[in-house]
Structures are given as structure tokens and as C-alpha cells.
Interface confidence: low
């Protein structure tokens, strides 16, 4: 043999119980000691440091801390140095060294030593990662190194987490013993933070010890808080909330059309939209994500606003008889009431639509004029004016005539036309045609679609002359012999000498 000792490098026991530190030693055979003695020291292997003596086989003298609390269970003659320590208190925790004493110079303090840990809580071993929905094994492990007191294990707060499996007393690698109880269960997200306890009780004593572990159950996010659809008036402030339950906390992301608007690692996240515009109307998505999964939900934001100024597309110049189609369109939320007026008369209207089509089949000159398209909802009203110009051949109105007074004849020719026509007065008896350009004889004035031309003739005539008014534009020509009326029918202003 050779000098050497074998004992567990570490051993633990509950406060108030006892501990048996298993120990064997060896020495060279040729020494053949008559008696083998031994000493157990506390915390230092060197006698010159005067460490506390735990046990000494030569005498009963021990340090006061170990008085009546230490006993050798092993037979030193059989090279067994097993030590029993009773009524353990925290100050007995530390290093224990054995010194073999074979007499004479043959004394040897072994460098191998045991570290005693005095504990007061069972050790609950939870896997480093506990994931909801995946079976997990939680163990409760307590030292069982006191031959006088054997622990009994029970679980606390395990209701609904399955039935324990007691493995019983197991020998560890270095010869120490443990009692082990296992709990197999499939955790749910609700089990997160659950306080699971293990109790070690020593029968026929008041000694009982409890240890607890809080389950840190990892689970994917579930969005639990989210606005339902939101209606907001243009210009107002909108706050969208997304709240998720997960462990660890999720990365919350607010998105719209695939674009990230805001994100943070948090249980809830607001998306604040200041002074919303119609452009912000749409679907907003909240994505909650952690290492264990993701969830997403959407909310629809509807921005309410007054109609935009209507736009008018279509014919604004038409030829008499043509069909005119005019489209008035706008944008609003909700959709507006659209109306097309002409001189306070409603020509067409639609309710809750964004466009209105006005159809005028075979337009007449009476359709010419100013029109209004009005869009209205509960948030406001906007209107757009447009003009329809109807083009047609000249019409000489029946009010056209001639009248004589003393030495003057005046002929009035009133023409309705679009575009403006040319007017000429023909005197067949004199083989003369007077155009409107001849300002000395013709005065013309236009008002709207009416052109009034007045021909003034001076000098005495035996009989009133025949006067024919001819009006012409690109759509046609009309002529009318102007009837003479009695002098009393007209007020004449004498022009010239």
C-alpha cells in the first residue's frame, strides 16, 4: 500500500440531523503498526496551526464545538476512518481532514478532505428550459447521509402537475447518498411563475425542511389586448394598443403594408398616430414574437373626413343634338351624397357613392349654362361649378322687325346662336347688303347667346323698304324678312342730322 485516503470531496446534510462521512485510508504495509490511531481536524490539515480537533482516538479531548457530537464509526485497524457528526449546526460546515497516526514518525495528514455543507432546504432541480407543452422532469434531491435519521420526501403545490415518482435512496459517485423524488408533467402557460415546493421530513422528529422553485415556463405570445376596428375623424389623435402574453416578453411590432411602424420588447405597445389623415386609413397589424413562437392580429382604422372638392370630367362644349355625359367624382369617408344642380334644379343625385354621372341626351340650347356638383357628408360639404356650352345654328327670333318714324327706318334683328354668328341686312329693292361691320349703319350688342343687331336707315321713302336679316355661323344660316310694325310700336331715337 501507500499513503492515501478516500472520502467524498463534498457531502451535505440537513441542519439538526447528522452526517456520516465515509472514509478509507491506506499506508505502506512494511510499517506494520501495532495500533493505528487517527485524528480528524476541522478546516486545516496542519497540526501546527492548532486546528479544532473533531475526533482523536488517543484521547477523548475534542474542541468544544464537537463535544458530544463526533464519533468514529469506522475501525481504524481496518483502515476505515468513517466519521459521524450529530446535531449539526451551521458552524460545523467546512473542511474535514483526517490524519493517520501509526506511532513514532509515521504520522500522515492526508491532503484529501471532505467539505461538509450544512443545508436547510431541499434541492429542487428544474431543467434550464421549461417550455409549455413539452414534458418536463423536475426532481427533488436531498442528502441521505445520516444513518440515524432518514428523510421522507413530499411535493408541495404540485396539484394538477402529475403524480410524483419516488426513486428512493441513490448512491452518488463518491459514496454519498441522496433521496430523489421526480415529478413529470407537461407545463402550460398558466404554470409560469407557479411555486413548486419539496418537503423533507424526518419521522419521529420536529425536523422538516422546505425548498421552493418558481417555474419559469417559456411560451409563445398570444395577443390578448387589441382595439377592435377604430373610427377616427381626420385630424384627431389615434392610439392603437397591442398587448401580448408570453414568456419571455415578446418583440411587439406594429406594421402596415409590410412596413414596420414601431417595435419594442414589451408586454404592450401603443401606436400613436397624431392628426390622422385619410392616407392612414387601412389595416394595421400587430406581430408578437419570441423564441417560442408568434401571434398576429389586425385592426382596421377608418379615418372619417369631409368630401374633397369634386372633380368634373366630360364634355363641356357640345353641339345641339349630341349626347352629353359628365362625371362628377370626389373622395370622402363615409361616401357622400352627390348632387348636380342647374339653376337650383336638381338634375341628378346619388347617395353614399363617390361618383355621379349626368347624361343629357340630345342637348338643346336650353341646356347651355352653369352647373354645380355638390358633395356632402356629416363632416362637411364641397362644391364645384362647371359650364356646359351648347353650340347650334343661328335662330332669328320672332321679335325681330323693322319700324319707320319720320325720316328714319330702324330694323331690329335678334339672333340666338352659339358660337356668335355674323349678321347682314339685305335690301333687295336697292340691291344693297349691309354687314354688321359697317358701324355707321349697324349697331350690334351680344348678351349671352343673344346677338341684337340694329340697322338704321335715314331719308324719306315712299314705301317702307323690304329688309332681310341673314345670320350665319359654322352650323348654318337663317334668313328672315323683317316685318314692319306701326310707328307707335317703337320709340325711335333720331340718329344723325
Amino acid at each position: 500500500g501507500h499513503w492515501g485516503a478516500w472520502m467524498p470531496s463534498s457531502i451535505s446534510a440537513f441542519e439538526g440531523t447528522c452526517v456520516s462521512i465515509p472514509c478509507r485510508f491506506d499506508f505502506p504495509d512494511e510499517l506494520r503498526p501495532a495500533v493505528v490511531h487517527g485524528v480528524w481536524y476541522f478546516n486545516s490539515p496542519y497540526p501546527k496551526n492548532y486546528p479544532p480537533v473533531v475526533f482523536k482516538s488517543r484521547t477523548q479531548v475534542v474542541h468544544e464545538s464537537f463535544q458530544g457530537r463526533s464519533r468514529l464509526l469506522g475501525d481504524l485497524g481496518l483502515r476505515n476512518c468513517t466519521l459521524l457528526l450529530s446535531t449539526l449546526s451551521p458552524e460545523l460546515g467546512g473542511k474535514y481532514y483526517f490524519r493517520g497516526d501509526l506511532g513514532g514518525y509515521n504520522q500522515y495528514t492526508f491532503s484529501e478532505h471532505s467539505v461538509l455543507d450544512i443545508i436547510n432546504t431541499p434541492n429542487i432541480v428544474v431543467p434550464p428550459e421549461v417550455v409549455a407543452g413539452t414534458e418536463v422532469e423536475v426532481s427533488c434531491m436531498v442528502p441521505d447521509n445520516c444513518p440515524e435519521l432518514r428523510p421522507e420526501l413530499s411535493w408541495l403545490g404540485h396539484e394538477g402537475l402529475g403524480e410524483p415518482t419516488v426513486l428512493g435512496r441513490l448512491r452518488e459517485d463518491e459514496g454519498t447518498w441522496v433521496q430523489v423524488s421526480l415529478l413529470h408533467f407537461v407545463p402550460t402557460r398558466e404554470a409560469n411563475g407557479h411555486r413548486l415546493g419539496c418537503q423533507a421530513a424526518f419521522p419521529n422528529t420536529t425536523l422538516q425542511f422546505e425548498g421552493y422553485a418558481s417555474l419559469d415556463v417559456k411560451y409563445p405570445p398570444v395577443i390578448v389586448e387589441m382595439n377592435s376596428s377604430v373610427e377616427a375623424i381626420e385630424g384627431s389623435h389615434v392610439s392603437l394598443l397591442c398587448g401580448a402574453d408570453s414568456n419571455p416578453p415578446p418583440l411587439l411590432t406594429w406594421m402596415r403594408d409590410g412596413m414596420v411602424l414601431r417595435e419594442a420588447v414589451a408586454e404592450s405597445l401603443y401606436l400613436d398616430l397624431e392628426e390622422v389623415t385619410p392616407a392612414e386609413d387601412g389595416i394595421y397589424a400587430c406581430l408578437a414574437e419570441n423564441a417560442y413562437g408568434q401571434d398576429n392580429r389586425t385592426v382596421e382604422l377608418s379615418v372619417m373626413y369631409a368630401p374633397w372638392k369634386p372633380t368634373v370630367n366630360g364634355t363641356v362644349v357640345a353641339v345641339e343634338g349630341e349626347t352629353v355625359s359628365i362625371l362628377c367624382s370626389t373622395q370622402s369617408n363615409p361616401d357622400p351624397i352627390l348632387t348636380i344642380f342647374k339653376e337650383k334644379q336638381i338634375l341628378a343625385t346619388v347617395i353614399y357613392e363617390s361618383q355621379l354621372q349626368l347624361e343629357l341626351p340630345a342637348v338643346t340650347p336650353e341646356d347651355d349654362g352653369e352647373y354645380w356638383c355638390v358633395a356632402e357628408n356629416q363632416y362637411g360639404q364641397r362644391a364645384t361649378a362647371f359650364n356646359l356650352s351648347v353650340e347650334f345654328a343661328p335662330i332669328i327670333l320672332l321679335e325681330s322687325h323693322c319700324a319707320a318714324a319720320r325720316d328714319t327706318v330702324q330694323c331690329l334683328c335678334v339672333v340666338k346662336s352659339n358660337p356668335e354668328p355674323s349678321v347682314a341686312f339685305e335690301l333687295p329693292s336697292r340691291n344693297v347688303t349691309v354687314n354688321e361691320t359697317e358701324r355707321e349703319f349697324v349697331y350690334s350688342e351680344r348678351s349671352g347667346l343673344l346677338l341684337t343687331s340694329i340697322l338704321t336707315l335715314r331719308g324719306q321713302a315712299q314705301a317702307p323698304p323690304r329688309v332681310i336679316c341673314t345670320s350665319r355661323n359654322l352650323y348654318g344660316t337663317q334668313s328672315l324678312e323683317l316685318p314692319f310694325q306701326g310707328a307707335h310700336r317703337l320709340m325711335w331715337a333720331k340718329i344723325g342730322p
Epitope: P128, P248, P249, L251, A264, A266
Partner: antibody, heavy 126, light 112 residues
């Protein structure tokens, strides 16, 4: 340049309330937590707790619950320590010190205090 | 809380000498998942605020001279200053930031 500038020294009577400010500059205020550390005259350092500048959530050490309150004015990049019902044993220099926040909750990653304020001496005496 | 004990409480050396100071924690500050020691060293000169020297037990903060070296793991740590300068006069604190943050009792370095 990263700086934490604290308010000036204070002389207070027992029972009064004191509020110390710590203005940060040279970095993004909300990317770093703000710690408060107490140093009694001639003594060592004692951690009082910290405030998460991103969420506003304070965490107090066991000995500093009740009379002590951490707060923020994020827009001004300023953290505050308020001590109410002052006692003689509150006489000390109080330091603010920043440390990185890890929003993703990875355990203990990098909670070392790298920049400190110059300290504010609070003297409590009747 | 994890208790941090520093030794010696004070020491005096001449400029140019090497100095070591110790810091022991009541529990290990080695975090198993990343194998990092959550221990820092600070220097506090008279009338000044603490200055970070070392973090992760051995990583030197930028701008700190390479005369300062941190070592150790678990519960036992050492700060070594080689070629001590007169401006190194200060109190040196170790600090664990694994659990509720605690500081060591401090080691006062005086220059002879």
C-alpha cells in the same frame, strides 16, 4: 462626450425631502439604465437600485425601499432620486451611474456601471 | 446578498512597484450559462466618483492603462497593478453584478 451631471450639494433638516437630479448627455438616454449608489462619509459604496429609462420601472435594493423614489424626465434626459423624511444616516454622497439595458431579458448580460456622475453631497443636520 | 470581502484593507507601496489586492465573494459569481464572472473593479480617487477599470473579472475598460490586470474566477479575484504610478493613489473596490449588486469593502492604496 458622455457625461452625467448631478445637482449641487444640499443641506437639509431631518424630516425634510430632497430631490437630486442627474442629467445625461452624449448618448441615447433610454438605451441605458440609471443606477443610484450611496457613499456615506469615509465609507464604501452601497447600491440603492436602478431605474429602467426605457420603461420607467424602478428597482430598489432591500435597504432602500419606502422613503426612496427614482423618477425620470425622459425629454430632458434626466433621472431623479428623491429621499423623503430625511434622517441623519442619509448624510452621504449620492452617485448616479449608467448601465446597459438589455430589452430582450437575456440573464444579467452586461449590467456593469461604466459612467458615473460627479456625486451630490446631502447633509442632514438639525 | 453576495458578500464581497477585500484584503488588505490598505497597503502602501513605492512608485514603480507591483501591487496585488484580493476580493473574495461569499458565493460564486461565475454564471454557468455564459461562463462569465460578473465581477468588476473600480478606482475611486479622493474626492472623485468611481471609475470603471475592469469588468467580466479580466476585461480592461477602454482607456485604462495595461498596468491594471484583473484575474480570478468563481469566488476569488485579484487586481494587480504593475509599475505603480503616484496617480494610482485611490481606493479600489470590487463589485459583483450577478445578484443584487454589492461592492467590496475597498482596498486603500497609498504611495510611500
Amino acid at each position: 462626450e458622455i457625461q452625467l451631471v448631478q445637482s449641487g450639494p444640499e443641506l437639509k433638516k431631518p424630516g425634510e425631502t430632497n430631490k437630486i437630479s442627474c442629467k445625461a448627455s452624449g448618448y441615447t438616454f433610454t438605451n441605458y439604465g440609471m443606477n443610484w449608489v450611496k457613499q456615506a462619509p469615509g465609507k464604501g459604496l452601497k447600491w440603492m437600485g436602478w431605474i429602467n429609462t426605457y420603461t420607467g420601472e424602478p428597482t430598489y435594493a432591500d435597504d432602500f425601499t419606502g422613503r426612496f423614489a427614482f423618477s425620470l424626465e425622459t425629454s430632458a434626459s434626466t433621472a431623479y432620486l428623491q429621499i423623503s423624511n430625511l434622517k441623519n444616516e442619509d448624510t452621504a454622497t449620492y452617485f448616479c451611474a449608467r448601465n446597459p439595458i438589455n430589452y430582450y431579458g437575456i440573464n444579467y448580460e452586461g449590467y456593469v456601471m461604466d459612467y458615473w456622475g460627479q456625486g451630490t453631497l446631502v447633509t442632514v443636520s438639525s | 446578498n453576495i458578500m464581497m470581502t477585500q484584503s488588505p484593507s490598505s497597503l502602501a507601496v513605492s512608485a514603480g512597484e507591483k501591487v496585488t489586492m484580493s476580493c473574495k465573494s461569499s458565493h460564486s459569481v461565475l454564471y454557468s450559462s455564459n461562463q462569465k464572472n460578473y465581477l468588476a473593479w473600480y478606482q475611486q480617487k479622493p474626492g472623485q466618483s468611481p471609475k470603471l477599470l475592469i469588468y467580466w473579472a479580466s476585461t480592461r475598460e477602454s482607456g485604462v492603462p495595461d498596468r491594471f490586470t484583473g484575474s480570478g474566477s468563481g469566488t476569488d479575484f485579484t487586481l494587480t497593478i504593475i509599475n505603480v504610478h503616484t496617480e494610482d493613489l485611490a481606493v479600489y473596490y470590487c463589485h459583483q453584478y450577478l445578484s443584487s449588486l454589492t461592492f467590496g469593502t475597498g482596498t486603500k492604496l497609498e504611495i510611500k
